[in-house]
C-alpha cells in the first residue's frame, strides 16, 4: 500500500438543510469491498463504526460538521470532505423583498433584502435551480444582495435563511419565496444557466449546499453574472466555498 | 464503580512473548472501545492499540504493528494484548483504558484507567 | 518524539497560576480534533482531567481550566496547591491514521 486510499463521499438524503423534526440519512461511500467505515461528527469530535447515519427527528443538536473515513486492512483512507448538516426552522422566518420591484427590466439592477426580525449578522441567499448559494455576511438585521445589470438568468425564485455567526448550523426558517421577473426578454439558449436544476422544497434540496459563494464587500452594488457554476461574482471578487472553520 | 484491572506482566527475554490481560466491571464492557497505553520507566504515555467495541475496528502505534495483537473478550468482560518479537524498548508498565461513550457516539478520550501492569524485557 | 509537543517542567509558587501548553499540527489539534489533559500523581495511573479542551470531570476543582485555539492548546491551574504536583499529559487525535498521540508530558513542581 502507498500513500492512503481515496477518499469516500459523505452525503445527507434528501438533503443537509434538515427542518427541524423531519429526518435525514448521512451516507458515507467509498470503493467497493470496503471493510469497516468511520462516521464523525466535528465539534465535539465523536465517531460511530458505521457507514450511515440515520437522525429520525432533526434536533438542534444534530447540526455540525461530519466527515467520514473507512479502513481496508490496516490502512486508513484519507477523509472525506466536511458535509455541514443544517438544522433549519430554528428561528422565525426572513422576509425577502425586491427593491424597486420584483419586476424588472432587463439590464436594470435590482436589490434583494432579507430582513430578519434578530440580530443576525449571516443571511444566504438561494435561486431555484442554482448548486449554491449567495451568502453575504452583514453586521446588522438586513442584508442586501445587490444584483446589476439583471440578466435572463437572473430570472427565478428565490428564497433566503438568516443565522447567528456564532451557531453557524442553526438557521431560520426560509423565507416566503420571491419570484423574480426580468421583463423584456429576448430569450437565446445561451441566456439560460446550464447548471442542473432542483426543486426548491427543503424537503428534496440538494444534499450539500456547497460550493458557495461567499460574498463579503462594502455596501456598494456588485456585479452578479451567471455561469455554469451558478451565479458566481466577476473579476475582482473571490470565490470561494462555504465551510466555517472550528 | 468502573474497574480496570490488568495483569499478564512480568520478565520476559528479548523475542519473547507475553499475553496481557485487563479485566473490566462496573460498566457494559461491549459499549466501549478500548485501548493500551504504555509509559516507560520515566517517560511518557504512548499509545500502542485500540479495538472497538465489537472487536471489528483495531488500530496500532506503528511501533507495534505486526507484533503486538489486540483482542476482546465481551462474554468475558476481558481485553488482551498478545505481545511478540519483544524488544528492550517494549519494557514499559501498560495501562488498559476506556473511551468514553455517550449515547451512540465514541469520543476520542479516555476516561477511565486501569493501574497497569509491568513488563519487562531484558537478557 | 512525542506528536504533541510540551514543555518538560513548569513550576511556581502555593497560590500562584501557571499554563502548560501543547502544540500539534494540521493533522491532529489543527485539523480540529479536541485536546484532553491527564494528571498522573506520582505513583498512580494517569486521570482524567479536562476533556474537550475545556470540559472538567466531575470532581475536578474549577482551579484547573484547559482552551484550544488553531493547532495549540493550554492548560491553566491557578491557586496552586501542593498536591497539584505531578506530570500532566496532553491528547488528541491524528487524522491520517486514525491514531491517539500524547505530548510528551510535563512535570509541574509546586515550590516551597
Known amino acids: 500500500q502507498s500513500g492512503p486510499l481515496p477518499k469516500p463521499s459523505l452525503q445527507a438524503q434528501p438533503s443537509s438543510l434538515v427542518p427541524l423534526g423531519q429526518s435525514v440519512i448521512l451516507r458515507c461511500q467509498g470503493p467497493p469491498d470496503v471493510d469497516l467505515y468511520r462516521l464523525e461528527k466535528l465539534k465535539p469530535e465523536k465517531y460511530e463504526d458505521q457507514d450511515f447515519l440515520f437522525i429520525p427527528t432533526m434536533e438542534r443538536s444534530n447540526a455540525g460538521r461530519y466527515r467520514c473515513s473507512y479502513q481496508n486492512g490496516s490502512h486508513w483512507s484519507l477523509p472525506s470532505d466536511q458535509l455541514e448538516l443544517i438544522a433549519t426552522g430554528v428561528y422565525a422566518k426572513p422576509s425577502l423583498s425586491a427593491h424597486p420591484s420584483s419586476a424588472v427590466p432587463q439590464g436594470r439592477d435590482v436589490t434583494l433584502k432579507c430582513q430578519s426580525p434578530y440580530s443576525f449578522d449571516e443571511f444566504v441567499l438561494y435561486k431555484e435551480g442554482d448548486t449554491g448559494s449567495y451568502k453575504r455576511p452583514e453586521k446588522w438585521y438586513r442584508a442586501n444582495f445587490p444584483i446589476i445589470t439583471v440578466t435572463a438568468a437572473h430570472s427565478g425564485t428565490y428564497r433566503c435563511y438568516s443565522f447567528s455567526s456564532s451557531s453557524p448550523y442553526l438557521w431560520s426558517a426560509p423565507s416566503d419565496p420571491l419570484v423574480l421577473v426580468v421583463t423584456g426578454l429576448s430569450a437565446t439558449p445561451s441566456q439560460v444557466p446550464t447548471e442542473e436544476s432542483f426543486p426548491v422544497t427543503e424537503s428534496s434540496r440538494r444534499p450539500s449546499i456547497l460550493p458557495t459563494n461567499k460574498i463579503s464587500t462594502t455596501e456598494k452594488p456588485m456585479n452578479i453574472t451567471a455561469s455554469p457554476e451558478g451565479l458566481s461574482p466577476p473579476f475582482g471578487f473571490a470565490h470561494q466555498h462555504y465551510a466555517k472553520g472550528n | 464503580q468502573v474497574q480496570l484491572v490488568e495483569s499478564g506482566g512480568g520478565l520476559v527475554k528479548p523475542g519473547g512473548s507475553l499475553r496481557l490481560s485487563c479485566a473490566a466491571s462496573?460498566?457494559?464492557?461491549?459499549?466501549?472501545?478500548m485501548s493500551w497505553i504504555r509509559q516507560a520507566p520515566g517517560k511518557g504515555l504512548e499509545w500502542v492499540s485500540s479495538?472497538?467495541?465489537?472487536?471489528?475496528?483495531?488500530d496500532y502505534a506503528a511501533s507495534v504493528k505486526g507484533r503486538f495483537t489486540i483482542s476482546r473478550d465481551n462474554a468475558k468482560n476481558s481485553l488482551y494484548l498478545q505481545m511478540n518479537s519483544l524488544r528492550a524498548e517494549d519494557t514499559a508498565v501498560y495501562y488498559c483504558?476506556?473511551?468514553?461513550?455517550?449515547?451512540?457516539?465514541?469520543?476520542?478520550?479516555?476516561?477511565?484507567w486501569g493501574q497497569g501492569t509491568l513488563v519487562t524485557v531484558s537478557s | 518524539q512525542s506528536v504533541l509537543t510540551q514543555p518538560p517542567s513548569v513550576s511556581g509558587a502555593p497560590g500562584q497560576r501557571v499554563t502548560i501548553s501543547c502544540t500539534g499540527s494540521?493533522?491532529?489539534?489543527?485539523?480540529?480534533?479536541?485536546v484532553h489533559w491527564y494528571q498522573q500523581l506520582p505513583g498512580t495511573a494517569p486521570k482524567l482531567l479536562i476533556y474537550?479542551?475545556?470540559n472538567r470531570p466531575s470532581g475536578v476543582p474549577d482551579r484547573f481550566s484547559g482552551s484550544k485555539s488553531g493547532t495549540s492548546a493550554s492548560l491553566a491551574i491557578t491557586g496552586l496547591q501542593a498536591e497539584d504536583e505531578a506530570d500532566y499529559y496532553c491528547?488528541?487525535?491524528?487524522?491520517?491514521?486514525?491514531?491517539?498521540?500524547f505530548g510528551g508530558g510535563t512535570k509541574l513542581t509546586v515550590l516551597g
Open positions: 483504558a476506556r473511551h468514553y461513550r455517550e449515547f451512540r457516539w465514541h469520543y476520542y478520550y479516555f476516561d477511565y
Open positions: 462496573g460498566f457494559s464492557f461491549s459499549d466501549h472501545y
Open positions: 479495538v472497538g467495541s465489537e472487536g471489528k475496528f483495531i
Open positions: 494540521s493533522s491532529n489539534i489543527g485539523a480540529g480534533y479536541d
Open positions: 474537550g479542551n475545556s
Open positions: 491528547q488528541s487525535h491524528d487524522l491520517g491514521a486514525h491514531v491517539w498521540v
